[in-house]
Interface confidence: low
C-alpha cells in the first residue's frame, strides 16, 4: 500500500537550497524526515518512503510512504503521524502542521531490497 503525505514545517523557511540535493540544508532535512518516519511507523509493515520533495510555504514536505499490503489504512497513517508531532518538535525541532494523507491508487516504482 502506498500513501501520499503532505505537511508543513512551520518553523523552517524554504530557500533555494531545498531544491538542490547536494546542499547541507536539503540533506539534513532529508535525513531527519527519513529517520522520523522510521520512528513513527515502527511496526513491521512499514517499508519506507520515497519521492520526497520540498516546496515553498514555510517548508512544505511531500512524500510517498510504502507499507505492506493490508497492514495500515489512510486514517491510521494520519493518526500515527499526528500523534508524533510533539516528539518531532522536541527530537528534531520540526513544528509540523497541515497534515494531509491520501491513498496512492496504483503501485509506483519504488526501490526495494
Amino acid at each position: 500500500s502506498f500513501f501520499f503525505l503532505s505537511f508543513h514545517i512551520s518553523n523552517l523557511q524554504f530557500n533555494s537550497s531545498l531544491e538542490d540535493p547536494s546542499t547541507d540544508y536539503y540533506q539534513e532535512l532529508q535525513r531527519d524526515i527519513s529517520e522520523m518516519f522510521l520512528q513513527i511507523y515502527k511496526q513491521g509493515g512499514f517499508l519506507g518512503l520515497s519521492n520526497i520533495k520540498f516546496r515553498p510555504g514555510s517548508v512544505v514536505v511531500q512524500l510517498t510512504l510504502a507499507f505492506r499490503e493490508g497492514t495500515i489504512n489512510v486514517h491510521d497513517v494520519e493518526t500515527q503521524f499526528n500523534q508524533y508531532k510533539t516528539e518531532a518538535a522536541s527530537r528534531y525541532n520540526l513544528t509540523i502542521s497541515d497534515v494531509s494523507v491520501s491513498d496512492v491508487p496504483f503501485p509506483f516504482s519504488a526501490q526495494s531490497g
Epitope: 540533506q27 531527519d32 522510521l38 513491521g44 526501490q111 526495494s112 531490497g113
Partner: antibody, heavy 125, light 110 residues
Framework: EVQLVQSGAEVKKPGASVKVSCKAS????????ISWVRQAPGQGLEWMGW????????NYAQKLQGRVTMTTDTSTSTAYMELRSLRSDDTAVYYC??????????????????WGQGTTVTVSS | SYELTQDPAVSVALGQTVTITCQGD??????AGWLQQKPGQAPVLVLY???SRPSGIPDRFSGSTSGNTASLTITGAQAEDEAEYFC?????????????FGGGTKLTVL
C-alpha cells in the same frame, strides 16, 4: 531477549562450499531482514548481502554476486548463507546481524542490532 | 579499500572526551551506524540515526552528522570503552544498494 545464534566453525578445502546458519529468537523474524558481514583475520568488516525474512528478497554485494546465496526458513526463524567456490581469502569470521532493511526511496539509514556470535570459516588445502 | 574513511587510531585520557570521525559521500543522504568491537567479540551497535542509542548503551555515547562527515563522541571515556569503532552506512550508486564500512578506529583509553 533478541538473540542470533550461529552454527559452529567450519574448515573447508579451496573450491568447496560452506553453509552457515543463524537462528533468531526474541522478535518477529519476518518483520526484519538479516545482513551477513564477514571479517578476515586482523581486518575490518565487509558487508556480504542482505535478505528480507518477510519475502525472501535479496541484495548481494557486487563482488560476491554469483558465489553467495542467502535464504531463510521462516518456520524455524533461521537464516542461511551459502558461499561457493571457496578461496583462501574467504577465511574469515562470518556474522549475521538483524537489519531493519528500510531500503525504499531516499532512506539510506541502516543499522545492525544485534549480531550473532560469529562463525569461523577456514579455507585451507 | 573502504568507501568510508576513519582515522586508524585515536587515544584519550580516562574521563576525557574523544571524537571519532567517519567521512564519505554516502553520509550525505544517510546517518551512520557506529559499532564497537572488542578483541575476540562480535560487534555491538552503540549509535545509529541522528541521536539514537540501543538500550543498554550509556549516554556518554553521542553522535552528529554534518555534510559528508559523521562523528561519534564519547564524553567521559571509561576503560571499558577501549575498543575498535566502525562506522557504516548504506550507499546507492546506479540504483545498486550496498552497505559500506569504514576501516575502523582503534580507541585507546590511557
Amino acid at each position: 531477549e533478541v538473540q542470533l545464534v550461529q552454527s559452529g566453525a567450519e574448515v573447508k578445502k579451496p573450491g568447496a562450499s560452506v553453509k552457515v546458519s543463524c537462528k533468531a529468537s526474541g522478535y518477529t523474524f519476518t518483520n526484519y531482514g538479516i545482513s551477513w558481514v564477514r571479517q578476515a583475520p586482523g581486518q575490518g568488516l565487509e558487508w556480504m548481502g542482505w535478505i528480507s525474512a518477510y519475502n525472501g528478497n535479496t541484495n548481494y554485494a557486487q563482488k560476491l554476486q554469483g558465489r553467495v546465496t542467502m535464504t531463510t526458513d521462516t518456520s524455524t526463524s533461521t537464516a542461511y548463507m551459502e558461499l561457493r567456490s571457496l578461496r583462501s581469502d574467504d577465511t574469515a569470521v562470518y556474522y549475521c546481524a538483524r537489519d531493519p532493511h528500510i531500503l525504499t526511496g531516499y532512506y539510506r539509514g541502516g543499522w545492525f542490532d544485534p549480531w550473532g556470535q560469529g562463525t569461523t570459516v577456514t579455507v585451507s588445502s | 579499500s573502504y568507501e568510508l574513511t576513519q582515522d586508524p587510531a585515536v587515544s584519550v585520557a580516562l574521563g576525557q572526551t574523544v571524537t571519532i570521525t567517519c567521512q564519505g559521500d554516502s553520509l550525505r543522504t544517510s546517518y551512520a551506524g557506529w559499532l564497537q568491537q572488542k578483541p575476540g567479540q562480535a560487534p555491538v551497535l552503540v549509535l545509529y540515526g541522528k541521536t539514537s542509542r540501543p538500550s543498554g548503551i550509556p549516554d556518554r555515547f553521542s553522535g552528529s552528522t554534518s555534510g559528508n562527515t559523521a562523528s561519534l563522541t564519547i564524553t567521559g571515556a571509561q576503560a571499558e570503552d577501549e575498543a575498535e569503532y566502525f562506522c557504516h552506512s548504506r550507499d546507492s550508486n546506479d540504483n545498486y544498494l550496498e552497505v559500506v564500512f569504514g576501516g575502523g578506529t582503534k580507541l585507546t583509553v590511557l
